[in-house]
Interface confidence: low
């Protein structure tokens, strides 16, 4: 039978009544056009809501938007639209909230062709109040917040000056002409590109990079040939043109940009790109693209340091500059990610990690699947996740992946049952173990989101037609109910819940049409009547992470450690409530094979968690730069996994030896950088 | 009112290109895809791309993948179409058409499909040696 | 590519009458389908958007159903101004695909 429709599904008693006295309608007196939300704060409450409305004149286009606040998490909007006093505000920046809980909110305002500057509007008190800004210049970009100091504010100008303003958006200084790019590092610190001859994209490949760590006092050029640059856990990374051809290769800085090591990574062409897939303060994801257009490249995974790199998936579907990759971390269980392969015959297939990278495989079939039409054989066949690559190419596909940090295990999504990813309408899945194992959780494609941190999960169906019904589950989707949350269908346009997955409250939006109009609306519906009692101790179970063999000593040894969390039960129908905290408890293992990844030189062959030397490389010195030195590497061929804890066990050795030789690859060596002052 | 105007008919060459205009008015030209279809004589509609004005990304449909380029200027609403290398079967009438619900348009349409609900009034292109 | 198969090639019915005209889809194309109506020398016209959302101004004797592989389109009452070409069309997967075309002819 269906999930949720077997005889063992339990009602969740006079749940339609507790929730009709907990569904709040809210009808916005608007036009259609576009709505943008975003909270305010940590569990403050605070949803502003700015909705614009485009009317095409014959000579111009007139906008109007509108500004709500609600202060109870959607429950009820009061138009605040005459604090901004009713000023058009461009979406194409949205909200600039804030980070943390400093209540802070800027909105950037449309001006008119004549004007000297852009204008803003900032709330500094969670939107109760605003403070109208002329500025001194037209904003590009959206103001970025300095994530140690949120009255640190810096943007970008249509002509290309670095803007800082020191006191939250009062007074603004252009510290720098000619920039590209700008972003906050750590401690007040800004790298940008500067540009000397015409502009951005004619130097491409020849701008500069700076470093400010006093907001503009003074700078430092910390390199030079820079095609781009990204910031990811505590690296600094820049593409760097190479001297005699139009290849590029990745450096690495973990001092702000003060020395610089050649990644050891392949070069890239014109054509190609590399791309930051995931970064942490002890590792790198790093994709390289592959030589033409292929729509693939490789993923390698770096060392401590971010300059070894051992190759971790080849195949990687990633299709172009700033195009589609479906990588995603699962962030309800550490060490997860999953991403999609794009293999000889064309077809396209998702693999797994548990480990960090270390090893990728298929995802288990679901108990309850059958092997669609994509399957060699009926019997044997895998679940393919559908992500970022199947939205862009218009599949029946709503929404990503889904997993949050603090309901531990859970991951949804959809998918397809086959040899590869399919075509067909896909359905949705849920793994509790962190994708482990799998179960067919809804037919057909949804819309879901996870409350309470993991003791709610609600659904909606994705349909074209207007929509009434909402799905709620309580035991991690193996059983649903559906409540009519009002007579009047609507065109269903998103779920809201508030970020982080510890809220009881969600917000369903869409818009009503009539004959003449059709206007934004929007129902908040709290759970917290259905969860109706604080869980307690006996409403938790431990559960061991990454446990595939529980005769084994090592099992749920993962990255050298392993860990028990207390998961609530799917049986007990309780809140954790907003001040849940997971509780684990961790446990060193013993060093294995299994805790190093294969050194610069080497690879794991398939099936083998034996380290050999690459043949190309065998007898060959082993040597690569760092800080501009050369360096002599002696390894039998493992490094330890960053963030891997284990201690004792298998011991190989590795050594790394100066050379003390200049390399003679184009570095950002200190002797090419210099410092000014304003 | 919507409206979508074509240039006029073109007589080509074959091995030779073409470039067909799309002048939009009446609605904001960024806030969704246009879509070309050609007709061939006595044939039915053949879908050949999609532009999102908004960013100008495109996608082409296979068949005329490496020939066909779409393209937009923000400035005067305008999106265009240039066929190269030319053959005898490109003979046909090229329609532009409003897409509404291409991924960037503003507000809940992008959701659903909403059709091509704006149409030019076609463009002949004849290929004739 | 999604194919969009039309039937049946012509159909001739009298004025006042009933037309029903088919479309399938090589695979599900959810009701991510639109219908068009074409006369000689003009541009299509769409009649029917979402599989059986009727277009702004068409007449009530229009009317879409279907999802999935199996769509319909029923005019209730055939006036002289709806003798035309019919074509479907998918938007579920790109590219974007027409059927063949129904042709409604006066009986």
């Known amino acids: 039978s269906a999930p949720g429709e077997d005889e063992e599904c339990g009602r969740v008693r006079d749940f339609v009544a507790k929730l009709a006295n907990n569904t709040h309608q809210h009808v916005f007196d608007d036009l259609r056009g576009s709505v943008s939300l975003s909270w305010v704060g940590d569990s403050t409450g605070v949803i502003l809501v700015l909705t614009t409305f485009h009317v095409p004149l014959v000579i111009m286009t007139f906008g109007q938007s509108k500004l709500y606040r609600s202060e109870d998490y959607g429950k009820n909007f009061k138009d605040i639209t005459d604090l901004i006093n009713n000023t058009f505000i461009r979406t194409e920046f949205g909200m600039a909230i804030g980070p943390e809980n400093s209540g802070k909110v800027v909105l950037t305002a449309e001006v008119s062709g004549g004007s000297r500057g852009g204008r803003i509007f900032r709330s500094s008190d969670f939107a109760k109040n605003f403070v109208q800004t002329d500025l001194p210049f037209h904003p590009l970009t959206q103001m970025m917040y300095s994530p140690q100091n949120s009255d640190y504010l810096l943007a970008l100008s249509t002509e290309n000056g670095l803007w800082v303003s020191k006191n939250f958006g009062g007074k603004w200084e252009e510290i720098h002409k000619a920039v590209c790019l700008a972003k906050w590092g750590s401690d007040n610190t800004i790298f940008f590109t500067t540009y000397a001859n015409g502009s951005c994209k004619a130097d491409l490949g020849a701008l500069e990079l700076w470093r400010t760590s006093d907001l503009g006092k003074s700078f430092k050029t910390i390199g030079v040939k820079i095609y781009s640059f990204g910031l990811g856990g505590r690296f600094l990374f820049a593409s760097v043109m190479a001297d005699k051809d139009t290849t590029r290769r990745i450096h690495v800085s973990t001092d702000q940009g003060d020395t610089w090591s050649m990644a050891q990574l392949p070069s890239v062409g014109q054509e190609q790109f590399y791309s930051i897939l995931a970064a942490n303060d002890d590792m790198v994801f790093m994709h390289v693209d592959e030589p033409g257009d292929t729509g693939f490249g490789t993923i390698f995974t770096s060392d401590d340091r971010g300059i070894v790199y051992s190759k971790s998936l080849d195949r990687h579907l990633y299709t172009t500059t700033g195009g589609e990759t479906d990588f995603t971390n699962v962030t309800s269980l550490r060490g997860v990610y999953i991403t999609s392969v794009l293999s000889e015959d064309n077809s396209i297939q998702t693999m797994i990690t548990f480990d960090q990278g270390g090893r990728w495989t298929h995802l288990r079939k679901p108990e309850n699947s059958e092997c669609d039409a994509t399957a060699k054989n009926k019997n044997e066949c895998s679940l393919h996740i559908h992500a970022s690559y199947s939205i862009s190419q218009k599949l029946n596909v709503p929404m990503a992946p889904l997993s949050e940090p603090n309901a531990v295990g859970i991951v949804i999504a959809h998918g397809s049952v086959g040899d590869a990813i399919s075509v067909m309408v896909p359905d949705v899945y849920i793994s509790d173990d962190g994708g482990y194992s799998w179960t067919k959780m809804l037919e057909g494609p949804h819309y879901y989101t996870i409350l309470d941190s993991g003791g709610i999960i609600v659904a909606i169906e994705h349909s074209s037609r207007p929509i009434n019904v909402i799905k709620f589950s309580t035991d991690e989707g193996q059983c649903w109910q559906t409540y009519t949350f009002t007579r009047d269908p609507i065109y269903f346009t998103g779920l809201a819940s508030e970020p982080g997955a510890r809220s009881m409250n969600i917000s369903i939006w869409g818009f009503t049409e009539s004959f003449l109009t059709s206007q934004w609306v929007s129902y908040t519906i709290d759970f917290k009547d259905i969860l109706e009692r604080n869980c307690e101790e006996k409403d938790y179970t431990i559960w061991l992470a990454h446990s595939t063999d529980p005769e084994d000593y090592e099992d749920g040894c993962i990255l050298g450690y392993k860990e028990q969390f207390l998961r609530l039960r799917k049986s007990s129908v309780c809140q954790n409530g907003r001040d849940y905290v997971v509780t684990k408890q961790p446990s060193i293992c013993l060093c294995s094979l299994e805790d190093f990844l294969c050194d610069f030189g080497y690879y794991r062959p398939e099936n083998d968690s034996k380290c050999v030397e690459q043949p190309e490389l065998k007898g060959h010195d082993l040597e690569f730069c760092l800080y501009g030195r050369e360096e002599h590497l002696t390894t039998n061929g493992y490094r330890k996994i960053p963030g891997d804890k284990c201690q004792g066990g298998v011991n190989p050795v590795r050594e790394v030896k100066d050379l003390k030789k200049k390399c003679t690859s184009n570095f950002l060596s200190p002797e090419k950088q210099n410092s000014k002052s304003n | 009112q919507v409206q979508l105007v074509q240039s006029g008919a073109e007589v080509k060459k074959p091995g030779a290109s073409v470039k067909v205009s799309c002048k939009a008015s009446g609605y904001t030209f960024t806030s969704g895809y246009m879509s070309w279809v050609r007709q061939a004589p006595g044939q039915g509609l053949e879908w050949m791309g999609i532009?999102?004005?908004?960013?100008?990304?495109?996608s082409y449909a296979q068949k005329f993948q490496g020939r066909v380029t779409m393209t937009r200027d923000t400035s005067t609403s305008t999106v265009y179409m240039e066929l190269s290398s030319l053959r005898s079967e490109d003979t046909a009438v090229y329609y532009c058409?409003?897409?509404?619900?291409?991924?960037?348009?503003?507000?809940?349409?992008?959701?659903?499909?909403?059709?091509?609900?704006?149409w030019g009034q076609g463009t002949t292109v004849t290929v004739s040696s | 590519e999604i194919v969009m198969t039309q039937s049946p090639a012509t159909l001739s019915v009298s004025p006042g009458e009933r037309a029903t005209l088919s479309c399938r889809a090589s695979?599900?194309?959810?009701?991510?389908l639109a219908w068009y109506q074409q006369k000689p020398g003009q541009a299509p016209r769409l009649l029917i958007y979402g599989a059986s959302t009727r277009a702004t101004g068409i007449p009530a004797r229009f009317s879409g159903s279907g999802s999935g592989t199996e769509f319909t389109l029923t005019i209730s009452s055939l006036q002289s101004e709806d003798f035309a070409v019919y074509y479907c069309q998918q938007a579920r997967l790109g590219p974007w695909t027409f059927g063949g075309g129904t042709k409604v002819e006066i009986k």
């Open positions: 532009i999102n004005p908004y960013g100008g990304t495109t």
């Open positions: 058409a409003r897409d509404p619900s291409g991924i960037a348009a503003a507000g809940p349409a992008s959701r659903y499909y909403y059709g091509m609900d704006v």
């Open positions: 695979q599900s194309v959810s009701s991510n």
